[in-house]
Interface confidence: low
């Protein structure tokens, strides 16, 4: 069973008194409806809480909302509803918080049916003051901030107009009509799709993709016959209808849509979909749905141009368009991703890759766990992780897997141990090495969060009964202490800690229920006195990431380099602190076949590092479309992993020969593209 409060556990002394002095209760003086919480800025301590209560009447819905503000990480809250003139705020738009530490907040108000436009409340001083602004349109979406300039906002209206503000929502201008989808790109560029005839739905597959780089003064049509578009890393993707039939293909651009290439991916039919699972400036993980209602598809990984793709994983679970996938980027270790596959017998299994999609394996069975009823061989099985799909299926999984970039190597997730994901009640497992090895951390489902860059893990049991106990660990989940934070149990609804896992404060949210009323209540616990001293050099130890064979000179090499980290010793009870920066030492590796993905038309047989030709493509010349010209690829089956930094060693050659033939792409070629000005 999981380690608990036994003799071997390094217990924290006098923790009850220390935590009791740092536990702050706040009862919200309103009826329990819904509550949403937003952090304003980083390390500011400012939290906004919006509570809303709906009373459905015969003719209309009467709504009431209250706004609260904390500037001490949730220990105390002040009712600031009067700053928004006691207006009912539309929760479906949430609180639009500005990027970085801009201190900007936009709240969208509910207005009566006959009004000319909507209403927003704007703050640019971390919600100390708000300005009411009446809009010349009714917003359909939340206000979207430009990532480069928080004064620039865009919004779509209920009439499908694209509206832009250049002065943080003070004045608005409609820059285009008949807009379906709009997104900020880099350098304050806006990409959007428009319809010419009926509507977004009717014109799906016949939309135009437009771009404006000057907030609507001038436009450029960068694509036609568009079904949808997306941005990922430095890539712009568009799915484009084929000329001949109802299929569509992905086209990709790395220059903001000036030039396009056809991605070497299968085309999809009407019922299928593409999905960008993850993207960075180096490469893309793309899911391509299988024909029919199978609930699965194939993951492909791109080259550094987003054009040539390799098959990465078959039978990848992804239910329907906009449905559920378990694909998870493990942010605590470079190159690691976890997802689920649907096996032939319809069971769901978890797979993990440590090399950015090059190879996938099952998760190693935790040493302190037995195989469950799904296992055919009781001694050989794997850990299977519950993620979005399990949550959507209403399994007893309160949280998705958790990892944080500054808590190096730590991954926490619900799981079961067997041949497939089990419908039985899951337990919580932890990995301290980015997913290579796992340990059962807690019995039964829990909510969990990481504080102080991994120095503290906090958990609360998932129960239908009122709770008053929180668990915490200072040694990466090996040993647990329990703290009763209130005498009067509450119906627990959620844990909240500042994004980024640097804080030492945790807020426990819930409600109390008496005969006639129920009220929101929060308990904020500051763990600063548990971690009494600042960590020193002696508290850290050197850890080589991705290490599987210390005898091997190339041990730890992933994407052509290895990284040594300074990590907090499990036995050290000290503060990493808010300013903690992960210390890592990279070193370049010699190239091996592991640094190369299999090229298009090639695959790696299981347990083999060599790439072999896919039988169905044997003898076919590989031709693909690049910048509107047909190219011919001569390959020996390998291509370097995007972002791979290896030098020397093995170097399989790959060349691209230009056939100088025009592509039969149905996409606008650059010379046909037109510019327009307002």
């Amino acid at each position: 069973s999981a380690p608990g409060e036994d003799e071997e556990c390094g217990r924290v002394r006098d923790f009850v008194a220390k935590l009791a002095n740092n536990t702050h209760q706040h009862v919200f003086d309103d009826l329990r409806g819904s509550v949403s919480l937003s952090w304003v800025g980083d390390s500011t301590g400012v939290i906004l809480v919006l509570t809303t209560f709906h009373v459905p009447l015969v003719i209309m819905t009467f709504g009431q909302s209250k706004l609260y503000r904390s500037e001490d990480y949730g220990k105390n809250f002040k009712d600031i509803t009067d700053l928004i003139n006691n207006t009912f705020i539309r929760t479906e738009f949430g609180m639009a918080i500005g990027p970085e530490n801009s201190g900007k907040v936009v709240l969208t108000a509910e207005v009566s049916g006959g009004s000319r436009g909507g209403r927003i409340f704007r703050s640019s001083d971390f919600a100390k003051n708000f300005v009411q602004t009446d809009l010349p349109f009714h917003p359909l979406t939340q206000m979207m901030y430009s990532p480069q300039n928080s004064d620039y906002l865009l919004a779509l209206s209920t009439e499908n107009g694209l509206w832009v503000s250049k002065n943080f929502g003070g004045k608005w201008e409609e820059i285009h009509k008949a807009v379906c989808l709009a997104k900020w790109g880099s350098d304050n560029t806006i990409f959007f799709t428009t319809y010419a005839n009926g509507s977004c739905k009717a014109d799906l597959g016949a939309l135009e993709l437009w771009r404006t780089s000057d907030l609507g003064k001038s436009f450029k049509t960068i694509g036609v016959k568009i079904y949808s578009f997306g941005l990922g890393g430095r890539f712009l993707f568009a799915s484009v209808m084929a000329d001949k039939d109802t299929t569509r293909r992905i086209h990709v651009s790395t220059d903001q849509g000036d030039t396009w290439s056809m991605a070497q991916l299968p085309s999809v039919g009407q019922e299928q979909f593409y999905s960008i699972l993850a993207a960075n400036d180096d490469m893309v993980f793309m899911h391509v749905d299988e024909p029919g209602d199978t609930g699965f598809g194939t993951i492909f990984t791109s080259d550094d141009r987003g054009i040539v793709y390799s098959k990465s994983l078959d039978r990848h679970l992804y239910t329907t368009t906009g449905g559920e996938t378990d694909f998870t980027n493990v942010t605590s270790l470079r190159g690691v991703y976890i997802t689920s596959v649907l096996s032939e017998d319809n069971s769901i299994q978890t797979m993990i890759t440590f090399d950015q999609g090059g190879r996938w394996t099952h998760l190693r069975k935790p040493e302190n766990s037995e195989c469950d009823a799904t296992a055919k061989n009781k001694n050989e099985c794997s850990l299977h992780i519950h993620a979005s799909y399990s949550i959507s299926q209403k399994l007893n999984v309160p949280m998705a897997p958790l990892s944080e970039p500054n808590a190096v190597g730590i991954v926490i997730a619900h799981g079961s141990v067997g041949d497939a994901i089990s419908v039985m009640v899951p337990d919580v497992y932890i990995s301290d090495d980015g997913g290579y090895s796992w340990t059962k951390m807690l019995e039964g489902p829990h909510y969990y969060t990481i504080l102080d860059s991994g120095g503290i893990i906090v958990a609360i049991e998932h129960s239908s009964r009122p709770i008053n106990v929180i668990k915490f660990s200072t040694d990466e989940g090996q040993c647990w202490q329990t703290y009763t934070f209130t005498r009067d149990p509450i119906y627990f609804t959620g844990l909240a800690s500042e994004p980024g896992a640097r804080s030492m404060n945790i807020s426990i949210w819930g409600f109390t229920e008496s005969f006639l009323t129920s009220q929101w209540v929060s308990y904020t616990i500051d763990f600063k006195d548990i971690l009494e001293r600042n960590c020193e050099e002696k508290d850290y130890t050197i850890w080589l990431a991705h290490s599987t064979d210390p005898e091997d000179y190339e041990d730890g090499c992933i994407a052509g380099y290895k990284e040594q980290f300074l990590r907090l010793r499990k036995s050290s009870v000290c503060q990493n602190g808010r300013d903690y920066v992960v210390t890592k030492q990279p070193s370049i590796c010699l190239c091996s076949l592991e640094d190369f993905l299999c090229d298009f038309g090639y695959y790696r047989p299981e347990n083999d590092s060599k790439c072999v030709e896919q039988p169905e493509l044997k003898g076919h010349d590989l031709e693909f479309c690049l910048y509107g010209r047909e190219e011919h690829l001569t390959t020996n089956g390998y291509r370097k992993i995007p972002g791979d930094k290896c030098q020397g060693g093995v170097n399989p050659v790959r060349e691209v020969k230009d056939l100088k033939k025009k592509c039969t792409s149905n996409f606008l070629s650059p010379e046909k593209q037109n510019s327009k000005s307002n």
Partner: antibody, heavy 129, light 107 residues
């Protein structure tokens, strides 16, 4: 009201297969799992396995692995249990039972087990040469 | 698999008296335990879930307690309709397993 209606009694020869159906009504079929439990004459209850009506994923007791197949038809809200290579000791009453097994009831989801709260009337299967 | 052991196998009690049935698990099942009542020729009926919560429509004379490996079903004052066989069942770890049953008969 919520009910599970099972197919009628069956008499089978050793080595044959039997397929028992269980039709659910009165609730959202895909919102709860379905377990199968059997009871030999004069004996206690024995759990055979469980099926998730949403994806059709199953978990069987080791004893029945390889002999039992549980399937579902969401269009008719019916689950099926097929037991093959029948032997005389498979003579029993077979029950389907709605099993929340980790699915939350109203309110916050729970790690507490809600129990098999609705049972079919049972299907008697007799295996005899 | 987790083995559930019920005791006693048979319990003879007079109407109006208190009946205490015991169920022991071979390893911790936390609170993932249910109790069922079965009368001859009928399907089992859920009495208690989560070790201690009465199912809908179950009279207050039935109560469950325990956690981990030791569990008890108590019938505070036996009525004539309570004479039946009672089973405990764990749902902590697959496969689900039942106890062998306790028959409560009229003394």
């Amino acid at each position: 009201q919520v009910q599970l209606v099972q197919s009628g009694a069956e008499v089978k020869k050793p080595g044959a297969s039997v397929k028992v159906s269980c039709k659910a009504s009165g609730y959202t079929f895909t919102s709860r799992y379905m377990s199968w439990v059997r009871q030999a004459p004069g004996q206690g209850l024995e759990w055979m396995g469980i099926i998730n009506p949403v994806g059709g994923s199953t978990s069987y007791a080791q004893k029945f692995q390889g002999r039992v197949t549980m399937t579902r038809d969401t269009s008719t809200s019916t689950v099926y249990m097929e037991l093959s290579s029948l032997r005389s000791e498979d003579t029993a009453v077979y029950y389907c039972a709605r099993d929340p097994s980790g699915i939350a009831a109203a309110g916050p989801a729970s790690r507490y087990y809600y129990g098999m709260d609705v049972w079919g009337q049972g299907t008697t299967v007799t295996v005899s040469s | 698999e987790i083995v559930m052991t019920q005791s006693p196998a048979t319990l003879s009690v007079s109407p109006g008296e208190r009946a205490t049935l015991s169920c022991r698990a071979s390893q911790s099942v936390s609170s993932n335990l249910a109790w069922y009542q079965q009368k001859p020729g009928q399907a089992p009926r859920l009495l208690i879930y989560g070790a201690s919560t009465r199912a809908t429509g179950i009279p207050a004379r039935f109560s469950g307690s325990g956690s981990g490996t030791e569990f008890t079903l108590t019938i505070s004052s036996l009525q004539s309709e309570d004479f039946a066989v009672y089973y405990c069942q764990q749902a902590r770890l697959g496969p689900w397993t039942f106890g062998g049953g306790t028959k409560v008969e009229i003394k």
